[in-house]
């Protein structure tokens, strides 16, 4: 692979449908602008879940309607995906691109298998 | 003598703490009495979860206080483990022994990683 990107093999979403994992990259240069993309792979289909560009030392900014939030610390990005349902179970791949200054580097992790279990509905309170 | 035993790699317990999986064995002979044991491996510690002996074509009979239930169909055993909590997450290994008639055969599967997520408590109904 190109740039090395590490992420956990398995993560369980909690009963509120929230899953968090760390995506860590080995930076070959002194990037100041980094782009992080989360991709979901299921049945050989890959779809983009969310993406954010951030300046080193600053917060990650996802779009307002994104299901992702995150923070960065050095070469580590702490990603949280919310609103997950059982049908969202799948392999979530972290892609990291060092956008600026040159040179451009990119790398992808092996993916984090996120398991999601739908909660039982609470009994009606009569 | 060794025997091939197959079981799924991963299973999720549902929100009520119930997990089910199939344990299938390649029977080298015409066994009439079979013993199935479920073992849990966590932190290199192996503990017995439950065990049952059954006559081919009959029901599996676990002890009354067992957390396991099961049914058999040919060389397949359908196992259900209940009362699971998040702390019970681990590798559950299926061990099969052909007890009678001789020769004795024994095999163990590679284990099923069972993931358990504790549900959120329902709000109090005032």
């Amino acid at each position: 692979k190109a740039m090395h990107v590490a992420q956990p093999a398995v993560v369980l979403a909690n009963s509120r449908g929230i899953a968090s994992f760390v995506c860590e990259y080995a930076s070959p240069g002194k990037a100041t602008e980094v782009r992080v993309t989360v991709l979901r792979q299921a049945d050989s289909q890959v779809t983009e879940v969310c993406a954010a560009t951030y300046m080193m030392g600053n917060e990650l900014t996802f779009l307002d309607d994104s299901i992702c939030t995150g923070t960065s610390s050095g070469n580590q990005v702490n990603l949280t995906i919310q609103g997950l349902r059982a049908m969202d179970t799948g392999l979530y791949i972290c892609k990291v691109e060092l956008m600026y200054p040159p040179p451009y580097y990119m790398g992808i992790g092996n993916g984090t298998q996120i398991y999601v279990i739908d909660p039982e509905p609470c009994p009606d309170s009569d | 003598k060794a025997m091939h035993v197959a079981q799924p790699a991963v299973v999720l317990a549902n929100s009520r703490g119930i997990a089910s999986f199939v344990c299938e064995y390649a029977s080298p002979g015409k066994a009439t009495e079979v013993r199935v044991t479920v073992l849990r491996q966590a932190d290199s510690q192996v503990t017995e979860v439950c065990a049952a002996t059954y006559m081919m074509g009959n029901e599996l009979t676990f002890l009354d206080d067992s957390i396991c239930t099961g049914t058999s169909s040919g060389n397949q055993v359908n196992l259900t483990i209940q009362g699971l909590r998040a702390m019970d997450t681990g590798l559950y290994i299926c061990k099969v022994e052909l007890m009678y008639p001789p020769p004795y055969y024994m095999g163990i599967g590679n284990g099923t990683q069972i993931y358990v997520i504790d549900p959120e408590p329902c709000p109090d109904s005032d």
Epitope: K1, A2, H4, A26, S27, P28, G29, K30, L39, V46, I93, K95, E97, P102, P103, Y104, Y105, M106, I108 | -
Partner: antibody, heavy 115, light 107 residues
């Protein structure tokens, strides 16, 4: 101004060795993974070898066609990268370019393998 | 190894036209694709990196798109200066294979 200057090309007999050198200037050499790419009329552009930088422990990677015959090395203090080519074959002929993470390219040096 | 299938191998277009070159890959390369322009007798020049990003100093008439296993390079409002051979390259993993090239000529 970014510059990459390759030297060391020329005519060589099959089976003989040759060493190419590339000196870089105008960019932070130590931040770049350095590569050799060759161009021939038969094969178009063909990636040959890569040497990564210090954070990647100077890992080296080679195309299958040169593995075991070519060796890439670098000297960050001289902003230089080298390609030692042994047991040269006819199919190794072409223009050899030195490139920094494919962003910057040298003018190339021609390697001709002939008896 | 990742195979790169570039098409067409050559194309001829008039000044002012828009042309598209495509590059297919044998497996998903997650946007790890560069495009290069090589003019006759010159070194290759990086044109597009990471599938969609325009390299410094290159005209905004060039644009890259695509994901997964299908990528394309679009050249809008063709100039005589665009006569060159264009190459795609996998930069996700070694070996960093190139496409066969597309030779662009002006009618």
């Amino acid at each position: 101004e970014v510059k990459l200057d390759e030297t060391g090309g020329g005519l060589v007999q099959p089976g003989r060795p040759m060493k190419l050198s590339c000196v870089a200037s105008g960019f932070t050499f130590s931040d770049y993974w350095m590569n050799w790419v060759r161009q021939s009329p038969e094969k178009g552009l063909e990636w040959v070898a890569q040497i990564r930088n210090k954070p990647y422990n100077y890992e080296t990677h080679y195309s299958d066609s040169v593995k075991g015959r070519f060796t890439i090395s670098r000297d960050d203090s001289k902003s230089s990268v080298y390609l030692q080519m042994n047991n040269l074959r006819g199919e190794d002929m072409g223009i050899y370019y030195c490139t920094g993470t494919f962003a910057y390219w040298g003018q190339g040096t021609l390697v001709t393998v002939s008896a | 190894d990742i195979q790169m299938t570039q098409s067409p191998t050559s194309l001829s277009a008039s000044v002012g036209e828009t042309v598209t070159i495509t590059c297919g890959t044998s497996e998903n390369i997650y946007g790890g694709l560069n495009w290069y322009q090589r003019k006759q007798g010159k070194s290759p020049q990086l044109l597009i990196y990471g599938a969609t990003n325009l390299a410094d100093g290159m005209s905004s008439r060039f644009s890259g798109s695509g994901s997964g296993r299908q990528y394309s390079l679009k050249i809008s409002s063709l100039h005589p200066d665009d006569v060159a051979t264009y190459y795609c390259q996998n930069v996700l993993s070694t070996p960093y294979t190139f496409g066969g090239g597309t030779k662009l000529e002006i009618k």
